[in-house]
């Protein structure tokens, strides 16, 4: 079977302050099993935005119904965007393990924040 790919179709997204940003991500396979996580930025200082496995992320909702067993759409919506949210967001597939290990990352989506229209 073909190896899993993580697809972030949008190189960039621009959103007005106060609006919601939708960041798209799909995977091409459910194997290997393991959670999806979203990060802002790359490297050791990257910020966790959403973890499929656990955690409380009040501003983040999944766009599709993530509890579907065959779900391959891990797009998220981030509400009430502010200029502090600007950055590049990465959708990352982890492979199960102790601990889970990063398996494949999407290419990233750069979020820019426009001034709130007056």
């Amino acid at each position: 079977e073909e190896e899993l790919q993580v697809i972030q179709p949008d190189k960039s997204v621009s959103v007005a302050a106060g609006e919601s940003a939708i960041l798209h991500c799909t995977v091409t396979s459910l194997i290997p099993v393991g959670p999806i996580q979203w990060f802002r930025g790359a490297g050791p200082a990257r910020e966790l935005i959403y973890n499929q496995k656990e955690g409380h992320f009040p501003r983040v909702t999944t766009v599709s119904e993530s509890t579907k067993r065959e779900n391959m759409d891990f797009s998220i919506s981030i509400s009430n965007i502010t200029p502090a949210d600007a950055g590049t967001y990465y959708c990352v597939k982890f492979r199960k393990g102790s601990p889970d290990t990063e398996f494949k990352s999407g290419a990233g989506t750069e979020l820019s924040v426009r001034a709130k229209p007056s």
């Epitope: 459910l30 194997i31 099993v33 656990e54 119904e65 509890t67 579907k68 067993r69 065959e70 199960k96």
Partner: antibody
Framework: DVQLVESGGGVVRPGESLRLSCAAS????????MSWVRQAPGKGLEWLAG????????YYIDSVKGRFTISRDNSKSSLYLRMNSLTAEDTAVYYC???????????WGLGTLVTVSS | ALTQPASVSANPGETVKITCSGG??????YAWYQQKSPGSAPVTVI????ERPSDIPSRFSGSASGSAATLIITGVRVEDEAVYFC???????????FGAGTTLTVL
């Protein structure tokens, strides 16, 4: 505290139908996929059916497909299992279970006994 | 199908290991369910291979490697006597399966 309480079991004759209910409390029911699992007398556990959090997607073991129907009413925090054309082999304790993010089970109900006998 | 031993016995304080085989490591997540008497509600002691619910004692742990999962009870107690079912979820088939159960006797 998470609570799952099944009801609707009882004694029925072969060929008859029954609808089991599971009342959920102590968590956001509409955020979790749910399943039904049964245990025949002196036997092990057998997964029967699962349903996504929104109720749009259902999954069944082959042996009950077309005969059993899983459904849910999120406004009532309730899960259901409609069982048609019952046979003696369906005699079991029926449990509802809450699914984890990866479709295992973290909480179980106390079960309801279904006896199919002429 | 998942395969586990029919029975295991141990003295109080010993470490017990129960194995479960038959799943593909890359597509299967494992869990362990404790049932203290037939027909009573199962209790999840481990899910997601190695995650322990907050209300389960720390003497219960789990691991998975290759095609097998292991439940470890470190310092087993008399109250741990039960049947332990391994369960699996297969991401290829979308199906949940269970082993036949292992009866743990604490001597």
């Amino acid at each position: 505290d998470v609570q799952l309480v099944e009801s609707g079991g009882g004694v029925v004759r072969p060929g008859e139908s029954l609808r089991l209910s599971c009342a959920a409390s102590g968590f956001t029911f509409s955020s979790h996929a749910m399943s039904w699992v049964r245990q025949a007398p002196g036997k092990g556990l057998e997964w029967l059916a699962g349903i996504s959090a929104g109720g749009s997607d259902t999954y069944y073991i082959d042996s009950v497909k077309g005969r059993f129907t899983i459904s849910r009413d999120n406004s009532k925090s309730s899960l259901y299992l409609r069982m048609n054309s019952l046979t003696a082999e369906d005699t079991a304790v029926y449990y509802c279970a809450r699914e984890t993010w990866n479709h295992l089970f973290d909480y179980w109900g106390l079960g309801t006994l279904v006896t199919v006998s002429s | 199908a998942l395969t586990q031993p029919a029975s295991v016995s141990a003295n109080p304080g010993e470490t017990v290991k129960i194995t479960c085989s038959g799943g593909d490591y890359y597509s299967t997540y494992y869990a362990w369910y404790q049932q203290k008497s037939p027909g009573s509600a199962p209790v999840t002691v481990i899910h997601s291979d190695d995650e322990r619910p907050s209300d389960i004692p720390s003497r219960f742990s789990g691991s998975a490697s290759g095609s097998a999962a292991t439940l470890i009870i470190t310092g087993v107690r008399v109250e741990d006597e039960a049947v332990y079912f391994c369960g699996g979820y297969d991401g290829r088939t979308y199906i949940n399966t269970f082993g036949a159960g292992t009866t743990l006797t604490v001597l």
